[in-house]
């Protein structure tokens, strides 16, 4: 028999907590409370520890950091004597992906918890439509992602597997293209990137609309729509209309959702419809001219999703002008 | 180096009071817990009370109750224990040890050599 | 309070050998365990700590395992020199020993 008060104490098991780099985390760890508190957090990597905090007579003790947690950890000091010993992480590298023990003693009791640090990135990723030369390409491409992803294409909905994959970045994060060679095609396709430690998806769909053959001084109506299936209401998405022509990309109109503002770089270009439910993002483009015929590409983006819908807009000398020839 | 000094063996009349002494060296004194811990002659070991010398705060073992008062002398480096109203159960050796906590370890890992203390009239 | 149970007394061993001293926790002590030598005549000495984590300067011939309630202290390659009395000792509250295992060499 001791002299003390009786306190239940849970054990806790090794957490796995999994943070963003560049963000701030919180490595969790409780403790009975008790007076004469110790701290002291650890980080083990195959052949070393190294002190990352440590907290006694009191205070915090950082003789002994390890420099490589200067100014990035510190611990809730007016909640120690309540029994956390949790550990606030700012700033996350991937370096910093491990294991990391705190070792706490008061008067009464000694105790470890262990918590296993993972780090992931996962920069929204784009679906890019290129041409080069008489070639299409579908490019999937994420500047920053870790670990790997799981890249997957589907062509009409059915799994495909040849694809060019590109990648940079030998330890992480990693900077991933993956080429789709779609020329001749009027396939629908969709490409999805699994970051699976973060539990996060991105895909990208890309239709191509039948052609539509105008007159000039006509006008035509591109059509765009966002799918229900992709974007939960309260989603924050963009929508942008662009010209492509001989490979370079000339953006015709932009909206935001965030701030329901739109931007025309084009005078002929219109919504064709008020953008009062959001999900119709449909175009006109007025007064068609010869050099119109070409390439038009909507392009809805949000975090997990980017629609790409392609049209091809043919323009035919009218009557009037043919004759006048 | 790091040591800790008892003083030597003592031999006492029952019912006398009994100061011994534990001089630490070769390292900061007041970031190290001193723990006294009894061991008797069929070898079993048990913790009688331990000081924390930076506040000066004791945690005691229930079954030592009333039998040991510690103190520190923080100047000196010297942890002493005061056993009172001795009887013939108290003869055996007892032994301060360092319990570390600065480096994680929360063990001893430095032990005094012992009093040996016999009480007899 | 938590009582440490040592149950072999006295095991006996050849030079070269293996063994292995058991302990037992009446409850769940994580991994707060420390194992202890005390030579014939001689202070105890820290040989284990946090159940596995051997201290300075000792031989890897020693290896301390497990958690919770059961703790196995190893000697591989059993020496003379290793001729003692050897303690578990739980900090997961307070402090309390076992009651010591004696290693006699045949």
């Known amino acids: 028999i001791f002299l003390s008060a009786f306190f239940t104490y849970v054990p806790m098991n090794e957490q796995i907590i999994i943070g963003r780099l560049g963000e701030d985390i919180i490595l969790p760890s409780s403790f009975e409370r008790g007076s004469e508190v110790v701290i002291h957090w650890k980080y083990q990597d195959s052949y070393n520890s190294y002190n990352v905090h440590s907290y006694y007579k009191g205070s915090g003790r950082l003789e002994s950091q390890d420099t490589r947690y200067a100014n990035r950890t510190s611990l809730f000091y007016n909640e120690i004597q309540n029994g956390n010993a949790s550990l606030f992480f700012r700033r996350l590298s991937l370096l910093d992906e491990g294991i990391y023990t705190c070792y706490v003693g008061t008067a009464i009791q000694a105790i470890t918890n262990k918590v296993v640090l993972k780090v992931g990135v996962f920069l929204t990723p784009m679906m890019k439509y290129e041409k080069r030369n008489t070639n299409s390409f579908l490019i999937c491409n994420v500047l920053s992602v870790y670990p790997r992803p799981i890249i997957t294409w589907k062509m009409d909905n059915t799994p495909i597997s040849e694809n060019n994959m590109q990648e940079t970045g030998s330890l992480g994060p990693f900077s991933i293209n993956s080429t789709l060679n779609i020329t001749g095609s009027n396939s629908s396709y969709e490409c999805t990137i699994e970051n699976s430690l973060l539990k996060q998806t991105w895909t990208g769909r890309w239709t191509m609309k039948d052609g539509l053959h105008k007159m000039q001084s006509e006008h035509v109506s591109l059509s765009c729509e966002l799918v229900n299936d992709y974007f939960s209401p309260n989603q924050d998405f963009k929508v942008t209309w662009s010209r492509m022509e001989s490979g370079i990309s000339s953006i015709l109109a932009y909206y935001l959702s965030s701030s329901q503002n739109t931007t025309f770089y084009e005078s002929r270009f219109s919504w064709n419809k008020e953008l009062k439910n959001q999900s119709d993002f449909s175009m006109n483009l007025t007064d068609l001219s010869l050099s119109d015929s070409g390439e038009y590409l909507c392009n809805i983006s949000s975090d997990e999703y980017t629609l790409l819908t392609i049209h091809t807009v043919h323009v035919e000398p009218s009557q009037e002008t043919a004759s006048d020839n | 180096e790091i040591q800790l000094q008892q003083t030597g063996p003592e031999l006492v009349k029952p019912g006398a009071s009994l100061r011994i002494s534990c001089k630490a060296s070769g390292y900061s004194f007041t970031d190290y817990i001193i723990v006294w811990v009894k061991q008797n002659q069929g070898k079993n070991l048990d913790w009688i009370e331990k000081i924390n010398p930076y506040y000066g705060t004791t945690t005691y073992n229930l079954r030592f109750e009333d039998k040991a008062t510690l103190t520190v002398n923080k100047s000196s480096t010297t942890a002493y224990m005061q056993l009172n109203s001795l009887t013939s159960e108290d003869s055996a050796v007892y032994y301060c040890?360092?319990?570390?906590?600065?480096?994680?370890?929360?063990?001893?890992?430095?032990w005094g050599q012992g009093t040996s203390i016999t009480v007899s009239s | 309070d938590i009582v440490m149970t040592q149950s072999h007394k006295v095991m006996s061993t050849s030079v070269g050998d293996r063994v292995s001293i058991i302990c037992k926790a009446s409850?769940?002590?994580?991994?707060?365990v420390a194992w202890y030598q005390q030579k014939p005549g001689q202070s105890p000495k820290l040989l284990i700590y946090?159940?596995?984590t051997r201290h300075t300067g000792v031989p890897d011939r020693f290896t301390g395992s497990g958690s919770g309630t059961d703790f196995i202290l190893t000697i591989t390659n059993v020496q003379s020199e290793n001729l003692a009395n050897y303690f578990c000792?739980?900090?997961?509250?307070?402090?309390?020993f076992g009651g010591g295992t004696k290693l006699e060499i045949k």
């Open positions: 040890a360092r319990w570390d906590y600065v480096s994680t370890l929360f063990a001893m890992d430095y």
């Open positions: 000792q739980q900090y997961k509250r307070y402090y309390t």
């Open positions: 409850q769940d002590v994580g991994t707060a």
């Open positions: 946090w159940a596995s």
